[in-house]
């Protein structure tokens, strides 16, 4: 059976939107009005992995681009990157570990924990216009809570 996907945008808990910053980076900033069209639309795929009521394994691709968020070790540090893939083969039910995030729902907010690096989360900075990154702390300065907005296909 083909992998189930939905299109969505994400905003952090400070209502910052995610936009492309160069070919292989996302940044978070406040957008208004027509500028909202700049925000990236994700194709969120529901993939194979350990699942529970509040934790669902997903992969986050950029809609109509052959790019996926992935978590790899760079200089001994878990790092978030945008990785290009062969569009003939993706998305797929059995994604490589680096592409998998545990989507965790808590109090109507979403967290995205790396399946490869437990307790590391997709994060944004308090500051405007800074890169989206993989953070190893929750409840500190950096933001790990998001809301999801559905986008029609």
């Amino acid at each position: 059976a083909p992998v189930r996907s939905l299109n969505c945008t994400l905003r952090d808990s400070q209502q910052k939107s995610l936009v492309m910053s160069g070919p292989y980076e996302l940044k978070a900033l406040h957008l208004q009005g027509q500028d909202m069209e700049q925000q990236v639309v994700f194709s969120m795929s529901f993939v194979q992995g350990e699942e529970s009521n509040d934790k669902i394994p997903v992969a986050l691709g950029l809609k109509e681009k052959n790019l996926y968020l992935s978590c790899v070790l760079k200089d001994d540090k878990p790092t978030l990157q945008l990785e290009s893939v062969d569009p003939k083969n993706y998305p797929k039910k059995k994604m490589e570990k680096r592409f998998v995030f545990n989507k965790i729902e808590i109090n109507n907010k979403l967290e995205f924990e790396s399946a490869q690096f437990p307790n590391w989360y997709i994060s944004t900075s308090q500051a405007e216009n800074m890169p989206v990154f993989l953070g190893g702390t929750k409840g500190g300065q950096d933001i790990t809570d998001f809301t999801m907005q559905f986008v029609s296909s």
Epitope: G49, E50, V72, V85, D86, K94, K97, A115, Q116, F117
Partner: antibody
Framework: QVTLKESGPGILKPSQTLSLTCSFS??????????VGWIRQPSGKGLEWLAH???????SYNPSLKTRLTISKNTSRNQVFLKITTVDTVDTATYFC????????????WGQGTLVTVSS | DIQMTQTTSSLSASLGDRVTISCRAS??????LSWYQQKPDGTVKLLIY???KLHSGVPSRFSGSGSGTDYFLTISNLEQEDIATYFC?????????FGGGTKLEIK
């Protein structure tokens, strides 16, 4: 010091099930990011990746053999197992287990291999 | 599946030579490539990971390079103990696949 050691039946007949064990020391499969894979090598030929298991129980298989393969682990006993059903003579090979950490995989430590012969 | 091709199955060189072994992927593998040495007794060791990073304990005469689909293992000053078969492995996409191997012999 990390060591891995494969063990198997040595010889078995076509249509039987091959059971392999990888016993290791020097690391724990409960450590986040840790994985163990199985790779085989027919005599005089190249290496073929078969299956892999991560610390969290997540499994991956080579699709060309997937229906015949089952990988499992006993974390407390430091062992990983591979079962191959309905073997044939083409499954005659040296079977290796190897350790990696994180994806993408580099197999950092390898066992010495165990020779399995399938013959009637 | 991603095919990994080592076009040279065997290579003959003299001690002290600089030897380069190549590996070609059927698609871009984002530098997710490692190199392994298999000695005649069957022992396998990791040499290089992530295209160019030297694994701990591996002599500095070994180096790796490449990008996209083309990758190279270079031995800068061939020694007797380097007589072995060398394999590449791609980790970009499941199933992980090895090259067919390059057997290095002494002239």
């Amino acid at each position: 010091q990390v060591t891995l050691k494969e063990s198997g039946p040595g010889i078995l007949k076509p249509s039987q099930t091959l059971s392999l064990t990888c016993s290791f020391s020097g690391f724990s499969l409960s450590t986040s990011g840790m994985g163990v894979g199985w790779i085989r090598q027919p005599s005089g030929k190249g290496l073929e990746w078969l299956a892999h298991i991560w610390w969290d129980g997540d499994e991956s298989y080579n699709p060309s053999l997937k229906t015949r393969l089952t990988i499992s682990k006993n974390t407390s006993r430091n062992q990983v197992f591979l079962k191959i059903t309905t073997v044939d003579t083409v499954d005659t090979a040296t079977y290796f287990c190897a350790r990696n950490r994180y994806d993408p995989p580099w197999f950092v430590d390898w066992g010495q291999g165990t020779l399995v012969t399938v013959s009637s | 599946d991603i095919q990994m091709t080592q076009t040279t199955s065997s290579l003959s060189a003299s001690l002290g030579d600089r030897v380069t072994i190549s590996c070609r992927a059927s698609q871009d593998i984002s530098n997710y490539l490692s190199w392994y040495q298999q000695k005649p007794d069957g022992t396998v060791k990791l040499l290089i990971y992530y295209t160019s990073k030297l694994h701990s304990g591996v002599p500095s005469r070994f180096s790796g390079s490449g990008s996209g689909t083309d990758y190279f293992l270079t031995i800068s000053n061939l020694e007797q103990e380097d007589i072995a078969t060398y394999f590449c492995l791609q980790g970009k996409m499941l199933p992980w696949t090895f090259g067919g191997g390059t057997k290095l012999e002494i002239k």
